[in-house]
Amino acid sequence: PEPPTACREKQYLINSQCCSLCQPGQKLVSDCTEFTETECLPCGESEFLDTWNRETHCHQHKYCDPNLGLRVQQKGTSETDTICTCEEGWHCTSEACESCVLHRSCSPGFGVKQIATGVSDTICEPCPVGFFSNVSSAFEKCHPWTSCETKDLVVQQAGTNKTDVVCGPQDRLRA
């Protein structure tokens, strides 16, 4: 018969034989033969393979380097890589999270639209009319101007995007 040209899922073709791939967490030691199954061995400590494979070496788990502001979010297994994240106040510079940078602060006149996470930076937005921020912060949103009217006061000084309004007493009508 014709030797196979394609194999089933979780198999690979070698020497006209369809051999079983090694399961996740294991590496290939020797190909199958006519009379023997594929030989696979578990990955060692701090190694992994996350797919059905014919790799002869397992991949090393990612190292979360504290010198780069990284820490372990999820410890790797023989089937999964370690997931790193950044220390509090820092976020990843890329999707792979290979290093961290300090969260950005929103300058006066800008408020925090979205607080930073381990993987995303702070998102700032300009304070719209009626709102202000007078601090540089990674957490503070734009605050609404004080409503003088509700306090039976009048605006003595208009607010800006960086300052609150200044309220004062109403002028008394002279008799």
Epitope: S20, F35, T36, E37
Partner: antibody
Framework: EVQLVESGGGLVQPGGSLRLSCAAS????????MSWVRQAPGKGLEWVGF??????????EYAASVKGRFTISRDNSKSTLYLQMNSLRAEDTAVYYC??????????????WGQGTLVTVSS | DIQMTQSPSSLSASVGDRVTITCRAS??????LNWYQQKPGKAPKLLIY???SLQSGVPSRFSGSGSGTDYTLTISSLQPEDFATYYC?????????FGGGTKVEIK
């Protein structure tokens, strides 16, 4: 009944030829690899060769000691295995067993044996 | 070729004894190791395949173990019908090779 029955053994002179037969019954003969194993008087077992099944094209493999002198064939319509032995030597004297070779990738083995037929090579 | 060395070549034992036969391969055979029993004037009979799998119909007093190059056949309680010669056989590489045999005799 599942069985193998050998025939054709006997006395033959060095350099001579002999053909052994093995009649199979009770199983689908063409599905199986079939083998010959021999045993010299008072000695251990020695694999001689095998012929693959229908799915694998009835191709053959031989031990180095018999390669080029012995030929394994099969007639699936008769469920019979053959061993054609040429250029026989004194050291080929043995009981010849026909054996079915079976199993999966988790181990192949000789799981059915005939009763054996004695071949004596002597002048 | 892979050489298979059995030990001992013969042993004497009594009914009820626990008997152990070893088989050593000249290289690792990844558990592709079979055991056969042969009685005088009879054909061999498969007992165990792939190191430890018991062939259908074989009594459970027979067991196999091992890995790499070293394998063992154990008869937990020898019965009168177990006096025979036992052979190991590797099934990983052509040519298939057998051990020299271990003859189990009555003490």
């Amino acid at each position: 009944e599942v069985q193998l029955v050998e025939s054709g053994g006997g006395l033959v002179q060095p350099g001579g030829s002999l053909r052994l037969s093995c009649a199979a019954s009770g199983f689908t003969f063409s599905d199986y690899y079939m083998s010959w194993v021999r045993q010299a008087p008072g000695k251990g077992l020695e694999w001689v060769g095998f012929i693959r099944n229908k799915a694998n094209g009835y191709t053959t493999e031989y031990a180095a000691s018999v390669k080029g002198r012995f030929t394994i064939s099969r007639d699936n319509s008769k469920s019979t295995l053959y061993l054609q032995m040429n250029s026989l030597r004194a050291e080929d004297t043995a009981v010849y067993y026909c054996a079915r070779y079976g199993g999966l990738k988790k181990g192949w083995y000789f799981d059915l044996w005939g009763q054996g037929t004695l071949v004596t090579v002597s002048s | 070729d892979i050489q298979m060395t059995q030990s001992p070549s013969s042993l004497s034992a009594s009914v009820g004894d626990r008997v152990t036969i070893t088989c050593r391969a000249s290289q690792g055979i990844r558990n592709y190791l079979n055991w056969y029993q042969q009685k005088p004037g009879k054909a061999p009979k498969l007992l165990i395949y792939y190191t430890s799998s018991l062939q259908s119909g074989v009594p459970s007093r027979f067991s196999g173990s091992g890995s790499g190059t070293d394998y063992t056949l154990t008869i937990s309680s020898l019965q009168p019908e177990d006096f025979a010669t036992y052979y190991c056989q590797q099934g990983i590489n052509l040519p298939w090779t057998f051990g020299g045999g271990t003859k189990v005799e009555i003490k």
